[in-house]
């Protein structure tokens, strides 16, 4: 986690819609071959749910060992269970692989809660419902972990899709996607469609149901509606973006835009919630409470600790506001907004022994490490991680949960000035000063 001193803040001017549409860098521009179109073999290759993560099937070693791997755009290590664990049905057995190479190096990854540690090596890796290629990739064989694997989640490892800068033990350990692009002709881009069910799934339903798609090397038109709008990747470590404005039911939160990105804003498929910096969270909750004031919910609900329930089929979606995040656009002084519904930020949870209720957790929570656009946001959209052009695209997902009155939206352009000032600059630690 990053900790920094607060810098003086400046405000970006709000987003008045332009009467005239700016040129969009979406369908009008020619693309490299293979970047767009249909990727039938990769559609529906994810399973899972927001609370426990979305996973893809991968094979490791020779002969291939099949494992389910969590898709995580918030980290950069490919790490798999490599020893028995009570929550794992199977694990990577290096001794059975003729192509395994030991790097004779350990790796230790602590989290706020929990950790994993393991041994580094390389092996041959492929994705059965992905591009028809095999790559030699770095693998962290997890030998010990605490609060990392999730009981009943059905995944046995994690695929960190972010950049080398945040790889452990250091940035010299090439992430999987970098290896894939280097060793094959797969374009340097992937896209994710995470599909929330809109209702709780039990374990067998998760196994039977489709959780979405990870399109490796391209964009599939069938997975979204409308246009793709792109925001620059501010820095290649996490998938860092800049939020320039936040609205609740069209009402501007009116905060200094630097607060929205303090100390960063990232797109992270491995996080369940929309996580917001403390000040922003408090302002957002205050606004959501006011908008939904026809019902009074307990404090524990807003803290994400308690469920609220309605008789099946009677959830009053209309009393909850939509939330819009304005993201920096690709053109100077231009932004666009993504809008999510309560169907995204109220997460369905199976309550103890009851199918006659629809129960939900509030899936917006407080963060001390900046904004995290987790599954709650991503489930509304088809998200394109265009690494080649250092940008992230958003379009309305063809599988997002909505009702007959409202739908998630991606709209623009809007005029927003001084957007660069919305980014927070994390103070760099000067190593030399630590030597005194």
């Amino acid at each position: 986690t990053q900790h920094g001193i607060r810098l003086p803040l400046r405000s970006g001017l709000g987003g008045a819609p332009l009467g005239l549409r700016l040129p969009r860098e979406t369908d009008e521009e020619p693309e490299e071959p293979g970047r767009r179109g249909s990727f039938v073999e990769m559609v529906d290759n994810l399973r899972g749910k927001s609370g426990q993560g979305y996973y893809v099937e991968m094979t490791v070693g020779s002969p291939p060992q099949t494992l389910n791997i969590l898709v995580d755009t918030g980290s950069s290590n490919f790490a798999v269970g490599a020893a028995p664990h009570p929550f794992l049905h199977r694990y990577y057995q290096r001794q059975l692989s003729s192509t395994y190479r030991d790097l004779r190096k350990g790796v230790y990854v602590p989290y706020t809660q929990g950790k994993w540690e393991g041994e580094l090596g390389t092996d041959l890796v492929s994705i059965p419902h992905g591009p028809n290629v095999t790559v030699r990739a770095n693998i962290a064989a997890i030998t010990e972990s605490d609060k990392f694997f999730i009981n009943g989640s059905n995944w046995e490892g994690i695929l960190g899709l972010a950049y080398a800068e945040i790889a452990r033990p250091d940035d010299s350990l090439e992430p999987f996607f970098d290896s894939l692009v280097k060793q094959t002709h797969v374009p340097n881009l992937f896209s994710l469609q995470l599909c929330g069910a809109g209702f709780p799934l039990n374990q067998s339903e998760v196994l039977a149901s489709v959780g979405g798609s990870m399109i490796i090397g391209g964009i599939d038109h069938s997975l979204y509606t409308g246009s793709l709008w792109y925001t620059p990747i501010r820095r290649e470590w996490y998938y860092e973006v800049i939020i320039v404005r936040v609205e609740i039911n069209g009402q501007d939160l009116k905060m200094d835009c630097k607060e929205y990105n303090y100390d960063k804003s990232i797109v992270d498929s491995g996080t369940t919630n929309l996580r917001l910096p403390k000040k922003v969270f408090e302002a957002a909750v205050k606004s959501i409470k006011a908008a939904s004031s026809t019902e009074k919910f307990p404090d524990g609900f807003w803290l994400g600790e308690q469920l609220v329930c309605w008789q099946a089929g009677t959830t009053p979606w209309n009393i909850f506001p939509v939330i819009s995040l304005y993201l920096m656009g690709e053109v100077t002084n231009q932004s666009f907004r993504i809008t999510i519904l309560p169907q995204q930020y109220l997460r369905p949870v199976e309550d103890v022994a009851t199918s006659q209720d629809d129960c939900y957790k509030f899936a917006i929570s407080q963060s001390s490490t900046g904004t995290v656009m987790g599954a709650v946001i991503m489930e509304g959209f088809y998200v394109v991680f265009d690494r080649a052009r250092k940008r992230i695209g958003f379009a309305v997902s063809a599988c997002h949960v909505h009702d007959e009155f409202r739908t998630a939206a991606v709209e623009g352009p809007f005029v927003t000035l001084d957007m660069e000032d919305c980014g927070y600059n994390i103070p760099q630690t000067d190593e030399s000063t630590l030597m005194t």
Epitope: F297, V308, C309
Partner: nanobody, 129 residues
């Protein structure tokens, strides 16, 4: 103030029956959520059954479905738990719990501890094989 008083606990043979009562005093009873919870030694307190005294809807833990029945008598301000086909694993202290109506269309998850404001002292149920 709200008081809950349980009664009807005791010993029973496996396969036998008991009827627990919870008398409510100190407030207008109608419209409240009422629940029965139990706690075995060294275990967490768990929800067994609940009732919405306004609409009459009921909820049961999977472990007691088909064996236990929750009901209420508005006139008597009392909630009952009829326990049939008792099993040794039903041995526990049984608590009655109540909560005010939330004042909206939503309600708290009926079999969760945190959903209730008021608790009785408990009554012991022992089932021997």
């Amino acid at each position: 103030d709200v008081q809950l008083q349980e009664s009807g606990g005791g010993s029973a043979q496996a396969g036998g029956s008991l009827r627990l009562s919870c008398e409510v005093s100190g407030y207008t009873y109608s419209g409240y959520f009422m629940g029965w919870f139990r706690q075995a030694p060294g275990e967490e307190r768990e929800g067994v059954a609940a009732i919405d005294t306004n609409g009459g809807r009921t909820w049961y833990a999977d472990s007691v479905k088909g064996r236990f029945t929750i009901s209420h008598d508005n006139a008597e301000s009392t909630v009952y738990l009829q326990m049939n086909s008792l099993q040794p694993e039903d041995t526990a202290i049984y608590f009655c719990a109540a909560r005010r109506p939330p004042g909206g269309s939503w309600y708290p998850p009926p079999l969760r501890k945190y959903s209730y404001n008021f608790w009785g002292q408990g009554t012991q149920v022992t089932v021997s094989s």
